[in-house]
């Protein structure tokens, strides 16, 4: 004979557990129904009556099958430097994600609590380590033979051109100026060469974090308010 299906609430067999989407109520000592995502337990079960569930109120949620007495509060609204990538509903919490040009300075379990603007390296300094989702740009002074003439969170130090005849010598923030018609690019120590992306628009490039490998390109287009440029100390 097939085993009878027990309807909640029911007393479990000794040593057995309650079924999926059920929980054991210690007070009633019965297996009782959980509430579905988007709901919470309004009235707990007894020996004779099952759990009574109710919908979560506005700005609260439950993501899992549960028997909590109150739904969880959604996180605060996203700030102006964030995008709401997941809305607060009865079944899910709000997720805020930093806008381009910002990184997450204080993470949450999901999304970001506090965003900060990516540092911009000033002329004479280039990107030593690019920004990531959770770390800022690291700038370094341009080594001899290289320069950066931009204030940017993505530009690296580039090699000076080599002139047959130098009109103006290059420095950390300016390329050399040649009188010759056919300058070449130096292969100065520490200079980094990046292949340019195929694009008619100006395109920033970003070195890969590993210092031992030749950098490749990724597409990073910062936006938002300009944070302070990297100071002359290079820190």
């Amino acid at each position: 004979l097939p085993a009878q299906v027990a309807f909640t609430p029911y007393a479990p067999e000794p040593g057995s557990t309650c079924r999926l989407r059920e929980y054991y109520d210690q007070t009633a000592q019965m297996c009782c129904s959980k509430c579905s995502p988007g709901q919470h337990a309004k009235v707990f079960c007894t020996k004779t009556s099952d759990t009574v569930c109710d919908s979560c109120e506005d700005s609260t949620y439950t993501q899992l099958w549960n028997w909590v007495p109150e739904c969880l509060s959604c996180g605060s609204r996203c700030s102006s430097d964030q995008v709401e990538t997941q809305a607060c509903t009865r079944e899910q919490n709000r997720i805020c994600t930093c806008r381009p040009g910002w990184y997450c300075a204080l993470s949450k379990q999901e999304g970001c609590r506090l965003c900060a603007p990516l540092r911009k390296c000033r002329p004479g300094f280039g990107v030593a380590r690019p920004g990531t989702e959770t770390s800022d740009v690291v700038c370094k002074p341009c080594a001899p033979g290289t320069f950066s003439n931009t204030t940017s969170s993505t530009d690296i130090c580039r090699p000076h051109q080599i002139c047959n005849v130098v009109a103006i010598p290059g420095n950390a923030s300016m390329d050399a100026v040649c009188t010759s018609t056919s300058p070449t690019r130096s292969m100065a120590p520490g200079a980094v060469h990046l292949p340019q992306p195929v694009s008619t628009r100006s395109q920033h490039t970003q070195p890969t974090p590993e210092p031992s490998t030749a950098p490749s390109t990724s597409f990073l287009l910062p936006m938002g308010p300009s944070p302070p440029a990297e100071g002359s100390t290079g820190d």
């Epitope: 990538t85 993470s107 970001c112 990531t132 989702e133 597409f219 990073l220």
Partner: nanobody
């Protein structure tokens, strides 16, 4: 390394439709969120839509709700933005973006131009 390449932009009349595509290569499709942003001439880049994977949870800017639909085809490593009932104010460069852990959009494509004009 993540690379994103948008396509599908063009000139369309008001009320018309376009479907933008964003082909992803590298680690992108383990990204928690993919999104579309746009930048109109002389304006800041603004959020249009995002999609979470897995679960395919979507979110839209108010200006896109009811007209635009974001979708994702993991088999083709592509994210789409279906744009209907286009208006002149939808004109701009549309960028695809990735937020690998959902904390910050730090990977970007080069953009595709959308012009809505009669």
């Amino acid at each position: 390394e993540v690379q994103l390449l948008e396509s599908g932009g063009g000139l369309v009349q008001p009320g018309g439709s376009l479907r933008l595509s964003c082909a992803a290569s590298g680690r992108t499709f383990s990204s928690l969120f993919m999104g579309w942003f746009r930048q109109a001439p002389g304006k800041e880049r603004e959020f249009v839509a995002s999609i979470r994977y897995p679960g395919l949870i979507t979110n839209y800017a108010d200006s896109a709700k009811g007209r635009f639909t974001i979708s994702r085809d993991s088999a083709k490593n592509t994210v789409y933005l279906q744009m209907n009932s286009l208006r002149p104010e939808d004109t701009g460069v549309y960028y695809c973006a990735a937020a690998p852990t959902g904390r910050a959009f730090n990977y970007w494509g080069q953009g595709t131009q959308v012009t809505v004009s009669s």
